[in-house]
Amino acid sequence: VPGEAEQPAPELVEVEVGSTALLKCGLSQSQGNLSHVDWFSVHKEKRTLIFRVRQGQGQSEPGEYEQRLSLQDRGATLALTQVTPQDERIFLCQGKRPRSQEYRIQLRVYKAPEEPNIQVNPLGIPVNSKEPEEVATCVGRNGYPIPQVIWYKNGRPLKEEKNRVHIQSSQTVESSGLYTLQSILKAQLVKEDKDAQFYCELNYRLPSGNHMKESREVTVPVFYPTEKVWLEVEPVGMLKEGDRVEIRCLADGNPPPHFSISKQNPSTREAEEETTNDNGVLVLEPARKEHSGRYECQGLDLDTMISLLSEPQELLVNYVSDVRVSPAAPERQEGSSLTLTCEAESSQDLEFQWLREETGQVLERGPVLQLHDLKREAGGGYRCVASVPSIPGLNRTQLVNVAIFGPPWMAFKERKVWVKENMVLNLSCEASGHPRPTISWNVNGTASEQDQDPQRVLSTLNVLVTPELLETGVECTASNDLGKNTSILFLELVNLTTLTPDSNTTTGLSTSTASPHTRANSTSTERKLPEPESRG
């Protein structure tokens, strides 16, 4: 175009994609009457008439801009809507009078790219590679113009470095005219980079100024040879029989080598391989004292076939053996004495305790329990507890039953039972003695006997309440080689005046139960076990 070289630089108008560009024709009234203006778009030095203003009336020309132009600002401004990257070109207004004059506008279009998407190389990078390997790829979609990418490692920007760091960027143009940028970071990494955080940053411009968007941070799998192998035992601390114990191999290489765990055979001193689970963990559940011993781990690098051995580790599974009590089944006459001795073995120092089985009362702290002037009440269970104080929960116990010779001894001497005529009554009678007594009833009925413990027996009787039975009452008799004893149950008919609550009897339409709740003998004692502690 003649005289174009002398033209001043075009006015710069900057807009974002999708917005409206206001192209103000800078011709002064002296240069040309704005009531008669032609607007052109200039692309590759080719002018295309896009809009005409005649006598102040604006109208678009057919073509790509036809639907997007309108005259504004009393004819001085042409508005271009829904700006696209393809609109980045020179626009020119040309006034016709008094002589042809031009005013040029350079439209610059911008669009922020989407958040950068970073993908780490899933295959990882060996530290001994001869040249930079692909670490990660950063993609910034739909930006305009092409954004700049900066790679960061641990918050520091990475620069191109011969044979160490190489950044390879490329871009594609979408059908929209927007750019998608792809940048590949290649680097030679060292073992210390296994925890390094990499991210990419896109720098771009908008009419409002410079901006940036950062990707998320990623770590790349770094492969390096194993230098050390070691064993780890869980749980940490003192182990006891019954625990779940896990022995695992660990290594400082990536990927870890192939592991095998061996235990030294105490008799042959040879290392014997143990069977591990799929994860290479040796699980001892429940742990036993036989699991104690010397363990070691072997790590085999399947690429180099180099084998590494861990430091051996002693495993001690603490135990308490079966508890033995002597005598095992003591029998004594009333008034005599008895010494009970408790024995057990352990991997740790033991503590012994003797408890009365029925009450839980601690009788002695130590392995020997001495009982003097034995009474009938002294008969029954005694428990020895062997425990390791330093390892909570590690203990074993043994129960011994002490038998005191004597005639039967009734749980009650006599009892009143409220009944209804023609009901089936369920009666019970309890007796103890050594040898253990048997119980008989003075009436016909269905009787059954249960041994409660070596010296105690319980008999239950189901009987129909008849007038004769009401007359005679019911007796139960206990007998052994040393004598006999009797309990009496008095039956009384229920009526509204006599019906009173009785904690010792249960009555219903068809059953009534009479069970001993207290001992009839003045010498008997009964202790309750202590309540268990409530743990929050």
Partner: antibody, heavy 117, light 106 residues
Framework: QIQLVQSGPELKKPGETVKISCKTS????????MHWVKQAPRKGLKWMGW????????TYADDFKGRFAFSLETSASTAYLQINNLRNEDTATYFC??????????WGQGTLVTVSA | DIVMTQSHKFMSTSVGDRVNITCKAS??????VAWYQQKPGQSPKLLIY???TRHTGVPDRFTGSGSGTDFTLTINNVQSEDLADYFC????????FGGGTKLEIK
């Protein structure tokens, strides 16, 4: 003051031709563009197009291409609208409208054209 | 072509009230919009041009607003003489009128 005076009402048969005049005064005729607007009975306004009073170049809206013609008699400061081959649907009031460069408009009083067999 | 849509064909109001008459362009027209009032048997009368500039002699109870594609003519303190048809028109690219809104006084 600026005035636009239009010719009187017309009663025409289908197929005939009508020519409406719009005489202006109070301003330089060639300074302002001249537009034509149609208003059918009890309907809205429809822009028909305009004529450049400097060059005589007409511009027609899509619905008014073919049978409609804008012309000028600059010496008489008069604009004309001619409708050929009249149809019933051409029955309407036609307005001439002059616009200055600032988009201020000046309207004629309107001419009613009735097309009836 | 740019289409101007006046969604309300009729609007009913009372004397003293305020009324908003709206107009939507099918594409961006910036501020190149005028509003006209037409009473029965008369030529349209220019009220507003360049979207918000009041024409000479138009009472200040008439106000125009909007830009781009959405425009509003507001009449404050409606008077009985405001009973008329109201048209919007764009002139950013050729010219087109809206379909009109008839203002009725209750």
């Amino acid at each position: 003051q600026i005035q636009l005076v239009q010719s009187g009402p017309e009663l025409k048969k289908p197929g005939e031709t009508v020519k409406i005049s719009c005489k202006t005064s109070g301003y330089t005729f060639t300074d302002y563009s001249m537009h034509w607007v149609k208003q059918a009975p009890r309907k809205g306004l429809k822009w028909m197009g305009w004529i450049n009073t400097e060059t005589g170049e007409p511009t027609y809206a899509d619905d008014f291409k073919g049978r409609f013609a804008f012309s000028l008699e600059t010496s008489a400061s008069t604009a004309y609208l001619q409708i050929n081959n009249l149809r019933n649907e051409d029955t309407a009031t036609y307005f001439c409208v002059s616009y200055d460069y600032d988009a201020v408009s000046y309207w004629g009083q309107g001419t009613l054209v009735t097309v009836s067999a | 072509d740019i289409v101007m849509t006046q969604s309300h064909k009729f609007m009913s109001t009372s004397v003293g009230d305020r009324v908003n008459i709206t107009c939507k362009a099918s594409q961006y027209v910036g501020a190149a919009v005028a509003w006209y009032q037409q009473k029965p048997g008369q030529s349209p009368k220019l009220l507003i041009y360049w979207a918000s500039t009041r024409h000479t002699g138009v009472p200040d109870r008439f106000t125009g607003s909007g830009s781009g594609t959405d425009f509003t003519l507001t009449i404050n303190n409606v008077q009985s003489e405001d009973l008329a048809d109201y048209f919007c028109q764009q002139y950013g690219n050729y010219r087109t009128f809206g379909g009109g809104t008839k203002l009725e006084i209750k």
